[in-house]
Interface confidence: low
């Protein structure tokens, strides 16, 4: 049912850790622009896009990787308390803009142990293509869209 057909996925991660969120999109939208945005009182603010210049400013902490095959991956690293909030995967596809998946992120106090990754479940939505529901291994560092 898309963004509003179900409750947002809730992720909890400590300060300093990272999260990995995966969203499905339809195979017809493989060339469409994908966006990760944050729901703020003033709007759904795009944070990172598949169409942006990869020479991103130093210090960027959100990275979007279009893995192809109907799978989009978003990584938020070095999480801070102010990162708590609601986010969404969006695609500007053949059917027009679609919010594929929504995530509610809660930030916990920092952990003493080493940095951890919290992995979001695959986003099931009405616009998924079964052929794109594979769950590939996390890409290596050089496959991510990190400048």
């Amino acid at each position: 049912q898309g963004i509003v057909g179900s409750l947002p996925e809730v992720l909890q991660a400590p300060v300093g850790s990272s999260i990995l969120v995966q969203c499905h999109y339809r195979l017809q939208d493989v060339k469409a622009q994908k966006v990760w945005c944050r729901f703020l009182p003033e709007g759904c603010q795009p944070l990172v896009s598949s169409a942006v210049d990869r020479r991103a400013p130093a210090g960027r902490r959100t990275f979007l990787t279009d893995l192809g095959g109907g799978l989009l991956q978003v990584e938020m690293v070095t999480l801070q308390e102010e990162d708590a909030g609601e986010y969404g995967c969006m695609v500007d596809g053949a059917r027009g803009p679609q919010i594929l998946h929504r995530v509610s992120l809660n930030i916990l106090p920092p952990e003493e142990e080493e940095e951890t990754h919290k992995i979001g479940s695959l986003a099931e939505n009405a616009f998924s293509d079964p052929a794109g529901s594979a769950n590939p291994l996390e890409p290596s560092q050089d496959e991510k869209s990190i400048p």
């Epitope: 709007g43 603010q45 059917r95 027009g96 803009p97 679609q98």
Partner: nanobody
Framework: QVQLVESGGGLVQPGGSLRLSCAAS??????????VNWFRQPPGKQHEVVAS???????NYADSVKGRFTISRDNVKNAVYLQMNSLKPEDTALYYC???????????WGPGTQVTVSS
């Protein structure tokens, strides 16, 4: 600068109906180019999406309003509506519309309209 304006809110008894409207104050703005969400923010709670319509007319609804709320768009009047039936006290909230165009990231909000469901 595009300004969105909501209207149609008010006080209604449980089981009653209201129709909210969202219009743009700027000529040249077309809702048909945007993904439009109706949000609501209950007193003391976070905002939530209750209904969405994309440029091609595909609609989505929150589980809590399915079968009671209907989102629609009138391209001639250039407005988006939220028809709310069988209203419940828990539907009491500030309702506001949000239009987002992913290409370019343009997005606009209205100030909201208050809906109060009480006997």
């Amino acid at each position: 600068q595009v300004q969105l304006v909501e209207s149609g809110g008010g006080l209604v008894q449980p089981g009653g109906s209201l129709r909210l409207s969202c219009a743009a104050s700027t000529s040249g703005f077309s809702f048909s180019d945007y993904y439009v969400n109706w949000f609501r923010q209950p007193p003391g709670k976070q905002h939530e999406v209750v209904a969405s319509i994309n440029p091609n007319g595909f609609t989505n609804y929150a589980d809590s309003v399915k079968g009671r709320f209907t989102i629609s768009r009138d391209n001639v009047k250039n407005a988006v509506y939220l028809q709310m039936n069988s209203l419940k006290p828990e539907d009491t909230a500030l309702y506001y519309c949000h239009a987002v165009r992913i290409s370019g990231g343009a997005n606009y909000w209205g100030p909201g309209t208050q809906v109060t469901v009480s006997s």
